[in-house]
């Protein structure tokens, strides 16, 4: 595979060629990690330390800000508890979601005392409203972690907030919660490592199962410690967890606890020369590529190795049909702490645990009506035995011989002359962005990856912690501890001044228009457009 980028641009070169706009942060803020993209309003909302920003998608230099610090009393209490005044005793924004047409919902660590509020953004973009609802603060417990170092995954739908977070001061009680709304909070089982075992939450997504909204599920992506007996020694496993949107908890032992929670391992590995697979287990980020069928997005996952000796990163793709197959497969079971995990062979109670109450798959109306045997089984069998393997059983991108690791991913589906291509933008822990195109070979899922560009987007090497892609603006937005960067998805002119160079680049965004390498638009009826992504063959396409 060609691991040398077609273009390698330093931060200086990016600046000089007007290919990056940076917001270098405020003196009294940092941690620009929480992104919310609003294409309709043409805004990027960013949660940071003591601040929430509203950036103009056209140019992030144009922004509004809300200052939301903690009180001096709260900060002092945090300091007295032995916390770091700068790195911990502040309000680090961890949740930033659209609540309704006029408001956002935001939660922060609140100097180890999580707090949430609403942000008014007005009905229309031209209202130019961006202000904190000072009169309405809510307890942020179970929504934001106490500790800013901890990751949170959240999703706000129909006025209810799903959060994967730590619900305690010590950062030990990890759970997947549903709060807000009119119902009692619901959570995963406490004190049971089979449900969650020191998880690091990555993201949460709503995915429809059928045309009936009653079947909708919320999927959580996270990594966690492997449970004893699942692996020899201490290991991390990447996971996908599911919860039915209409799960209102059970009865008996699962009152106000999820009854439909199930999790499965995500495998991203390559066969080793000695017959032992090299596993990329540290899930770092997930991107769902929705096209045609919203019920079946393609899941892109960014993984790194757990080993300190062997450092590597990979991107794996998963299909939702494979995920669903695993959740319909055997449950993981063991008879005691010293036993191995085996596929459960006994009778699975009806309705099958993990099934949503609906007219589609069964005749029961509520999770509160589930029979006792279903509740008992669900409580003790939260994990599936089979893992989810990636499409084509291997990663589509692997990087092992470099001094960086992948941290983030966004993907754009691009129409080219010879078909559609997925272009990946991969963020790294040294502040670079890799632009990679997957090119189908014999079958659409048997892919070749071509590294198009490697761009340094921050002045100092800093880990990229957030990324959003605007198809409307054709821009990429990147967050880190230091600030926010904006860059166009394509820099066609930089590929060169000749048709051959443009064609060899194999960038789906670009084509030779007869006089320059420029943005390719499938609608433009120009016979002179030269582009060959699949083969990158200039001989066939360039007459010069």
């Amino acid at each position: 595979k060609n691991n040398v980028p077609r273009l390698k641009l330093s931060y200086k070169e990016m600046l000089e060629s007007n290919n990056v706009i940076t917001f270098n942060g405020l003196a009294n803020s940092s941690s620009y990690h929480t992104f919310l993209l609003d294409e309709e309003r043409s805004r990027l909302y960013v949660g940071a330390k003591d601040h929430i920003f509203s950036f103009d998608l056209v140019n992030i230099k144009d922004f509004q800000k809300i200052v939301w610090p903690v009180s001096y009393t709260r900060r002092d209490e945090c300091k007295w508890a032995g916390k770091d005044i700068l790195k911990e005793c502040a309000n680090f924004i961890k949740v930033l979601k659209a609540y309704n047409q006029t408001h956002l919902y935001a939660c922060g660590t609140g100097a180890f005392h999580p707090i949430c509020t609403y942000i008014e953004i007005g009905h229309h973009p031209e209202d130019n409203i961006f202000k904190l609802e000072n009169s309405h603060f809510e307890n942020g417990r179970g929504k934001s972690p106490y500790d800013p170092k901890l990751l949170t995954a959240s999703l706000l739908i129909d006025g209810e907030l799903y959060s994967g977070t730590a619900a305690d001061f010590m950062g030990r009680d990890f759970a997947i919660f549903r709060t807000l709304g009119h119902h009692h909070p619901i959570r995963t089982e406490q004190h049971d490592s089979r449900w969650l075992n020191d998880p690091k939450f990555i993201s949460a997504h709503l995915i429809s199962e059928s045309d009936n909204p009653e079947d909708d599920k919320v999927y959580f992506f996270f990594r966690e410690n492997a449970i004893d007996g699942e692996h020899s020694g201490k290991a991390t496993h990447a996971r996908i967890g599911q919860i039915c949107k209409n799960d209102f908890g059970g009865h008996r032992s699962l009152v106000n606890k999820w009854t439909t929670f199930l999790k499965a391992r995500l495998i991203c590995s390559v066969p080793g020369p000695n017959g032992i697979d090299t596993h990329f287990d540290e899930l770092q980020d997930v991107f769902l590529m929705n096209f045609k069928d919203p019920k079946n997005p393609v899941v892109y996952g960014v993984f790194t190795t757990s080993s300190n000796i062997f450092k590597g990163s990979a991107v794996c793709m998963y299909s939702m049909s494979d995920v669903r197959r695993v959740f319909l497969g055997p449950y993981a079971h063991r008879d005691g702490p010293n036993y191995q995990w085996v596929p459960y062979q006994g009778r699975v109670p009806y309705p099958r645990p993990g099934t949503c109450p609906s007219k589609t798959f069964g005749g029961f109306d509520s999770t509160k009506d589930l029979p006792d045997d279903v509740i008992t089984f669900a409580r003790s069998h939260p994990a599936m035995y089979n893992p989810v393997f990636p499409m084509n059983n291997r990663p589509i991108v692997i990087k092992t011989d470099v001094n960086y690791q992948f941290t983030q991913i966004v993907v754009d589906r691009v129409d080219a002359e010879d078909g559609q291509y997925d272009v990946m933008f991969i963020g790294t822990d040294v502040g670079t962005v890799l632009k990679v195109v997957s090119i189908p070979k014999e079958t659409w899922y048997d892919l070749e990856e071509v590294l198009l560009e490697e761009m340094t987007v921050f002045r100092e090497p800093t880990a990229i912690s957030a990324m959003e892609l605007s198809t409307k603006q054709q821009q990429l937005y990147i967050g880190s501890t230091a600030g926010v960067a904006q860059l166009p998805l394509h820099r066609c002119d930089i590929y060169g001044k000749a048709c051959a160079e443009c064609c060899l680049a194999r960038d789906p965004y670009c084509a030779w228009d007869g006089s320059a390498c420029s943005r390719y638009f499938p609608t433009a009826k120009r016979a002179t457009r030269a582009q060959d992504i699949r083969n990158g063959d200039p001989l066939t396409h360039c007459s010069d």
Epitope: E77, C78, W80, A81, F112, H113, P114, N139, R141, G142, Y146, A167, D168, F169, M170, R172, D173, H184, P185, R187, Q190, H191, D192, S193, R194, R252, S253, N256, R379, S380
Partner: antibody, heavy 123, light 112 residues
């Protein structure tokens, strides 16, 4: 009706051992987290140990760690506390208590208590 | 020395209102954790009186109420009756080491 009945208390010499039992009835014992809480004569309450429904989580107060062992037998609806290397300061009434988790935030409360069993450690 | 601080004793005449305070820190009550209250009548086991800061289990008279603010909580008893004479304990979650914490207890004396 929920009932918790402790037994096994008595007089023991310092360094000795004792095993307390708590027989539960009137509720699904295997669904609940259980605890031992003690009260020294004329003093306040002190949480001693807790165990989850499936024994997957077990925790102890620092004062008893390494000396006391909590366990349960769901088939017998019974909670146990094995107390070794007993000290004079372990003298107390030992209560068996059920975790209710009644509140919105699932913070542990003790919704039912047994009548307690007295453990006296003296030479 | 208990982690949660309560006054050792309070007293009041029948029909009066008394309050018992419970002060913690930013790592227990102040961390947003719920406070629960127990009543221990002489010679008996403790009984859950208030859970989740202000909720009464069934059977507990509405003369008993709880509240919480910041790092403190309080139990209020109105229309004091002779049978209310007991020890009252507050309790909060604390996370590991220890898992839960209790107040030192407050002896309520009903005068007369």
């Amino acid at each position: 009706e929920v009932q918790l009945l402790e037994s096994g208390g008595g007089l023991v010499q310092p360094g000795g051992s004792l095993r307390l039992s708590c027989a539960a009835s009137g509720f699904d014992f295997d669904s609940y987290e259980m605890n031992w809480v003690r009260q020294a004569p004329g003093k306040g309450l002190e949480w001693v140990s807790g165990i989850s429904w499936n024994s997957g989580w077990i925790d102890y107060a620092d004062s008893v760690k390494g000396r006391f062992t909590i366990s349960r037998d769901n088939s017998k609806n019974t909670l146990y506390l094995q107390m070794n290397s007993l000290r004079a300061e372990d003298t107390a009434v030992y209560y068996c208590a059920r975790s209710g988790y009644s509140s919105s935030w699932f913070d542990p409360d003790f919704d039912y208590w047994g009548q307690g069993t007295l453990v006296t450690v003296s030479s | 020395q208990s982690v949660l601080t309560q006054p050792p004793s309070v007293s009041g005449a029948p029909g009066q209102r008394v309050t018992i305070s419970c002060t913690g820190s930013s790592s227990n009550i102040g961390a947003g954790y719920d406070v629960h209250w127990y009543q221990q009548l002489p010679g008996t086991a403790p009984k859950l009186l208030i859970y989740g800061n202000s909720n009464r289990p069934s059977g507990v008279p509405d003369r008993f109420s709880g509240s919480k603010s910041g790092t403190s909580a309080s139990l209020a008893i109105t229309g004091l009756q002779a049978e209310d004479e007991a020890d009252y304990y507050c309790q909060s979650y604390a996370g590991p080491n220890p898992y839960v914490v209790f107040g030192g207890g407050t002896k309520l004396t009903v005068l007369g």
